[in-house]
C-alpha cells in the first residue's frame, strides 16, 4: 500500500550562470528509502543517491552537479538549456516507487528569484 506523498520545490526559477537546489521530501510513509534518482526531462539520469553506496553523479553532469543538501541536488553554472522538468524518484520498501516533479526556468534577467516553497505535485 503506497501511502506516502512527495513534496517538491515545485516551479522554480534561477539566473543563468548561477546555481539552484532541487529538493524533494517523502512524507506520510514509514517505508525505507533505498535509493533516490534524479532525472532530467529527457529521461537522462543526473545522479543517484543509494542508501548503501552513497552518491553517483553521472559522467555527463559531473562538472555541473553537486550532491545534496540531503537527498537533494545542486545544479551549477546554469544555462538556458537547463530549463525544463526534473524528477526525483524515491525507491522504497515495502511501498515501491514515488516520483516528484520540479520545473526549472533559467532566466537571463538579473532579477530572477529562486523560490524555495514546497508543494505537492
Amino acid at each position: 500500500m503506497m501511502t506516502g506523498t512527495i513534496e517538491t520545490t515545485g516551479n522554480i526559477s534561477a539566473k543563468k550562470g548561477g546555481s539552484v537546489i532541487l529538493q524533494c521530501h517523502l512524507s506520510s510513509t514509514m517505508a525505507q528509502v533505498t535509493q533516490v534518482n534524479w532525472e532530467q526531462h529527457d529521461h537522462s539520469l543526473l545522479a543517484i543517491r543509494n542508501a548503501e553506496l552513497g552518491w553517483h553523479i553521472y559522467p555527463a553532469f559531473k562538472d555541473r552537479v553537486a550532491p545534496g543538501p540531503g537527498l537533494g541536488l545542486t545544479l551549477q553554472s546554469l544555462t538556458m538549456n537547463d530549463t525544463g522538468e526534473y524528477f526525483c524518484t524515491y525507491h522504497t520498501y515495502p511501498d515501491g516507487t514515488y516520483r516528484g516533479r520540479i520545473f526549472l526556468e533559467v532566466l537571463e534577467s538579473s532579477v530572477a528569484e529562486h523560490s524555495a516553497r514546497f508543494q505537492i505535485p
Epitope: 503506497m2 525505507q32 533505498t34 535509493q35 534518482n37 529521461h43 539520469l45 543517484i48 543509494n50 542508501a51 548503501e52 553506496l53 553517483h56 525507491h91 520498501y93 515495502p94 511501498d95 515501491g96 516507487t97 516520483r99
Partner: antibody
C-alpha cells in the same frame, strides 16, 4: 560481458530444503541490487526475492516469506537463495537477475536452474 | 498486489508486419512497466522499462507506450528473430508482478 550462472537446483521432497547459487561476472557486483525470479511449469513468472547491492536490504513476497532467504557474498561475486519447507508449488525454473543501476527493471538474467519438489 | 493482465496470450504474424501486445494493471502503476523477451536457449532480454524507455542495444523497431493502467508494446516491421515469448512486469510497487505472457509465432 555480464554473465549470471545459476546452480544448485534439483529434485527435493516436500518439506525439504535447497540452496541456489548465482555466480556473477563482468560487472562490479556490489554496485547492483539482485533478484530471484521463478518460472512455473505453466510459464508464469513470479518475483521471489531481492537484495540491495551491499546486502543490507532484503525483500520477499508473502508467498515465500519465512521459507526463502536471499543473501549475497560480494567478495565471491555470488548471490544465494536458501529455500526451506518446500512445497510442490515451488517447482519452477529459478533465475537470478540484475537490477538496473537506476533500480528500473532487471537488465540481465541467467539461464536458470530447475527445482522440482515431488515425493 | 497489482494484477497484470496481458493480451493476447497468442499471436501469429508475418515478417514485416507491425504487432501490438497489451498489458493492463489492476490499479495505476504510473509509468513503471517493463517488457522482456524470452527465447529458448537464450537469457531473458529487457526491451523497455519505465513504460517507454528503450534499453540500450535494443533495436528501435521496439517501442513502448502507456501510463496509469494501460500499456502497449509495439514491434514494427517484424524480423525473423522477433518471434518469441514476451512478458510485461510492473516495477512500481512491491511485490513486482508479471503478465501471463504472449507467444508471438510466425504465420
Amino acid at each position: 560481458e555480464v554473465q549470471l550462472v545459476e546452480s544448485g537446483g534439483g529434485l527435493v521432497k516436500p518439506g525439504g530444503s535447497l540452496k541456489l547459487s548465482c555466480a556473477a561476472s563482468g560487472f562490479t557486483f556490489s554496485n547492483y541490487a539482485m533478484s530471484w525470479v521463478r518460472q512455473s511449469p505453466e510459464k508464469r513468472l513470479e518475483w521471489v526475492a531481492e537484495i540491495s547491492g551491499g546486502g543490507s536490504y532484503t525483500y520477499h513476497p508473502d508467498t515465500v516469506t519465512g521459507r526463502f532467504t536471499i543473501s549475497r557474498d560480494n567478495a565471491k561475486n555470488t548471490l544465494y537463495l536458501e529455500m526451506s519447507s518446500l512445497r510442490s508449488e515451488d517447482t519452477a525454473m529459478y533465475y537470478c537477475a540484475r537490477k538496473r543501476r537506476d533500480y528500473y527493471a532487471m537488465d540481465y538474467w541467467g539461464q536458470g536452474t530447475s527445482v522440482t519438489v515431488s515425493s | 498486489d497489482v494484477q497484470i493482465t496481458q493480451s493476447p496470450s497468442y499471436l501469429a504474424a508475418s515478417p514485416g508486419e507491425t504487432i501490438t501486445i497489451n498489458c493492463r494493471a489492476s490499479k495505476s502503476i504510473s509509468k513503471y512497466l517493463a517488457w522482456y523477451q524470452e527465447k529458448p536457449g537464450k537469457t531473458n532480454k529487457l526491451l523497455i522499462y519505465s513504460g517507454s524507455t528503450l534499453q540500450s542495444g535494443i533495436p528501435s523497431r521496439f517501442s513502448g507506450s502507456g501510463s496509469g493502467t494501460d500499456f502497449t508494446l509495439t514491434i514494427s516491421s517484424l524480423e525473423p528473430e522477433d518471434f518469441a515469448m514476451y512478458y510485461c512486469q510492473q516495477h512500481n510497487e512491491y511485490p513486482w508482478t508479471f503478465g501471463g505472457g504472449t507467444k508471438l509465432e510466425i504465420k
